[in-house]
């Protein structure tokens, strides 16, 4: 996790910085939301547990043509050790529950804020 989020800087970014930047991006999405986010697209809900970064990416990568979450998708890929492609699903998905992208982002943001406040970056 030491090479996360190198979009803004040339060198490796500490995990705490990468997580903070992801949180701030999710805040931006939430605050700047005028119309329904991603036209109200629905994504699989996930269990916010150990492998949630990959699970979150697997869910969001299935949303296409939504520029508002492209940066989030890129940032999440930095937290996920394996390559994720559309249509891929892990056991962390709650496969019977779909929620709007806006709700997904809100839930993810809250969970990441809690982790960050408690100093849990990995």
């Amino acid at each position: 996790l030491t090479c996360l989020g190198g979009f803004a800087s040339p060198g490796p970014v500490p995990p705490s910085t990468a997580l903070r930047e992801l949180i701030e991006e999710l805040v931006n999405i939430t605050q700047n939301q005028k119309a329904p986010l991603c036209n109200g697209s629905m994504v699989w809900s996930i269990n916010l547990t150990a492998g949630m970064y990959c699970a979150a990416l697997e869910s969001l990568i299935n949303v296409s043509g939504c520029s508002a979450i492209e940066k989030t998708q890129r940032m999440l890929s930095g937290f996920c050790p394996h390559k994720v492609s559309a249509g891929q699903f892990s056991s962390l998905h709650v496969r019977d529950t779909k929620i709007e992208v806006a709700q997904f982002v809100k839930d993810l943001l809250l969970h990441l804020k809690k982790l960050f406040r408690e100093g849990q970056f990995n």
Epitope: I23, V27, Q31, L110, K113, K114, F116, G119
Partner: antibody, heavy 120, light 107 residues
Framework: QVQLKESGPGLVQPSQTLSLTCTVS????????VQWVRQPPGKGLEWMGV???????SFNSVLKSRLSISRDTSKSQVFLKMSSLQTEDTATYYC??????????????WGQGVMVTVSS | DIQMTQSPHSLSASLGETVSIECLAS??????LAWYQQKPGKSPQLLIY???RLQDGVPSRFSGSGSGTQFSLKISNMQPEDEGVYYC?????????FGSGTKLELK
Amino acid sequence: QVQLKESGPGLVQPSQTLSLTCTVSGFSLTNYHVQWVRQPPGKGLEWMGVMWSDGDTSFNSVLKSRLSISRDTSKSQVFLKMSSLQTEDTATYYCARDGTIAAMDYFDYWGQGVMVTVSS
Amino acid sequence: DIQMTQSPHSLSASLGETVSIECLASEDISNYLAWYQQKPGKSPQLLIYHTSRLQDGVPSRFSGSGSGTQFSLKISNMQPEDEGVYYCQQGYRFPLTFGSGTKLELK
């Protein structure tokens, strides 16, 4: 408009448990986090803990063993319980709304506070 | 825990004067800093969050700056209603912590 109001006993015996209620209006507990802060007479502010909008809680580690926070969303109330009170727990206890849609945690609306004295 | 050190402990200013209050964090808190004003017998009121964002209804004579570990609150054109105790607060890491306060009085 947004309002928070603390209620509870003004006097608690040493070693007893303090129970406080924060009743809110003008916002939903499922959309905003509620924080607890206390202030001993003539002293500074100390963060105690938070009731997150999803019902989870986080606490100041120095108080964690004595503290619990719960809520009743249907009544728009958040409850704080603190056990084994000592004289140094004498303070004004505040509940406050968290700014929430921000990367940082801050307190944008405060209750008027309830003064709690621990004495026999 | 992140320690927040405020200075000065107290100061007095004349009407119309500009005053500054400093806040030093014991470690990097990015821009996750808020400022509050508290008047005697009242609850604190939010002035500024995220270092420099003014809370709704707060006069523009209040401004905040800084990043990392060093922050300041500036009050230009001191008014009688600006008397009170000012606290900084870090919202970066639990436990959330406050500065010890700066008492501002009118000369």
